[in-house]
């Protein structure tokens, strides 16, 4: 008789997770000297250890403990980029700028990014039936409280000036529910991070307008202002430029030292 | 280093046309935006026109909207402003420049410019 | 669209600092980009990206931007810094636009 399985709202663990995320560490190790010590076969099982088994609304930071031990990376504190709701032009960004780093240029980000994963209580199974949506279902799904974690730590290392992109064609642009509203911002150290600079993507080819005086931006700048960080805000227009440079990125023109 | 040569400058009557060129060398064309800048004799600079790098997307100054328009060759790393209906206002020395990259829109390479004047 | 607004001229005694201003409404929230240009020369780049210096460009030329006023820098000037300077930012579509340049003395 088949045992009866939790029907949860959101999508199941994505098919083939354990060995995409050994992949991906096999390869990130391979492009990244400074992560050539890593295990990645003990990467793995530190990551399996963090929901297998476990109640999938019941995940803690704590559960992620030896995966972040194992991960742990430095990065250029003052060459971090941030991003909301943008995240593709953010990742093309940093493909190109090769001195800037997003979370999912880190070890860490690249093994999880687009990734679902949970599993079941009392079983050493992965369910790649369905997994808890974080609004239907709960908030400490393995998958939430991991983008927690690393998000935290991420922010909690950025130092000097922190760049982060927002998208402006959003309603939304600053959105406090969003990972970077909800975690980062509140993580960034005012001991270590002097400011924090929002580029505002705009869409439209003929987009004049100053988004940098909506309000929901000037709702960031409160937050980040109370934090004892100073706040800039850049119109970015013709983010076309980003992406030409993502056909060939070793051209001149995809740097932006001059 | 990086080139960048405007040519087809001279003397039109108002009304005429003329067309300018930029040929551009020393770094790789296609993955510019490209701009024209004009300066009036005495006066301060005004930016004219500016073309993606692959050339879907063009701008121009109000001034000029209507009557110039800016194209690009890739294949011969060459940049033009061909310039219709011309008036005494539009006589100036222009300039080709290269745009600066990623997130910055200004311009990190002049060429030495081409004269037009515009007068009967 | 933004208008800059530059003095007409500035003068400094060699080895001074010189500061030239550019305003315009809510200026610090685009970047903004300075150009010197000599007689009969074209414009060069000195400041990109409100305070950037491209390779070349001595270490005496700074630039910042803050509320609506952009400022260029130049500490130790010297005889050869004297020339006309252009402010310049990007506010979309197709609205770019040059401040009305600062011709710089050097006393």
């Known amino acids: 008789v088949p045992r009866w399985r939790q029907q949860w709202s959101g999508p199941g663990t994505t098919k083939r997770f354990p060995e995409t995320v050994l992949a991906r560490c096999v390869k990130y190790t391979e492009i990244h000297p400074e992560m050539r010590h890593v295990d990645c076969q003990s990467v793995w099982d530190a990551f399996k250890g963090a929901f297998i088994s476990k109640h999938p609304c019941n995940i803690t930071e704590e559960d992620y403990q030896p995966l972040m031990k194992l991960g742990t990376q430095t990065v250029p504190c003052n060459k971090i980029l941030l991003w909301s709701r943008i995240k593709d032009l953010a990742h093309q960004f940093t493909q190109v700028q090769r001195d800037m780093f997003t979370l999912e240029d880190t070890l860490l980000g690249y093994l999880a990014d687009d990734l679902t994963w949970c599993g079941e209580f009392n079983t050493s199974k992965i369910n790649y039936q369905s997994c808890p949506d974080w609004r239907k279902d709960c908030s400490n799904n393995p998958v939430s409280v991991f983008w927690k974690t690393v998000s935290r730590r991420f922010a909690e290392a950025a130092c000097d000036v922190v760049h982060v992109m927002l998208n402006g064609s959003r309603s939304k642009i600053f959105d406090k529910n969003s990972t970077f509203g909800s975690v980062e911002v509140h993580n960034l150290q005012p001991e270590k991070v002097q400011t924090l600079e929002a580029w505002v993507i705009h869409g439209g080819r003929e987009d004049s307008r100053d988004l940098c005086q909506d309000p929901t931006i000037k709702e960031l700048e409160s937050i980040i202002s109370k934090r004892n960080i100073q706040f800039s805000c850049k119109n970015i227009y013709r983010p076309d430029k980003f992406l030409q440079c993502v056909k060939n990125p070793e051209d001149s023109s995809c740097t932006s030292e001059i | 280093q990086v080139q960048l040569v405007e040519s087809g400058g001279g003397l039109v009557q108002p009304g005429g046309s003329l067309r300018l060129s930029c040929a551009a060398s020393g770094f790789t064309f296609s993955s510019y935006y490209m701009n024209w800048v004009r300066q009036a004799p005495g006066k301060g600079l005004e930016w004219v026109s500016a073309i993606s790098s692959n050339g879907d997307i063009t701008y121009y100054a109000d001034s000029v909207k209507g009557r110039f328009t800016i194209s690009r060759d890739n294949s011969k790393n060459t940049l033009y402003l061909q310039m219709n209906s011309l008036r005494a206002e539009d006589t100036a020395v222009y300039y080709c420049?290269?745009?600066?990259?990623?997130?910055?829109?200004?311009?990190?390479?002049w060429g030495q410019g081409t004269l037009v004047t515009v007068s009967s | 669209d933004i208008e800059l607004t530059q003095p007409p001229s500035v003068s400094v005694a060699p080895g001074q600092t010189a500061r030239i201003s550019c305003s315009g409404d809510n200026l610090r929230h685009y970047y903004v980009y300075w150009y010197q240009q000599k007689p009969g020369q074209a414009p060069v780049l000195v400041i990109y990206?409100?305070?950037k210096r491209p390779s070349g460009i001595p270490e005496r030329f700074s630039g910042s931007n803050s509320g609506n006023t952009a400022t260029l820098t130049i500490s130790g000037t010297q005889a050869e810094d004297e020339a006309d300077y252009y402010c310049q930012t990007y506010t979309g579509g197709a609205s770019l636009v040059f401040g009305g340049g600062t011709k710089l003395t050097v006393l």
């Open positions: 420049a290269r745009d600066l990259p990623l997130v910055y829109t200004g311009f990190a390479y």
């Open positions: 990206g409100d305070s």
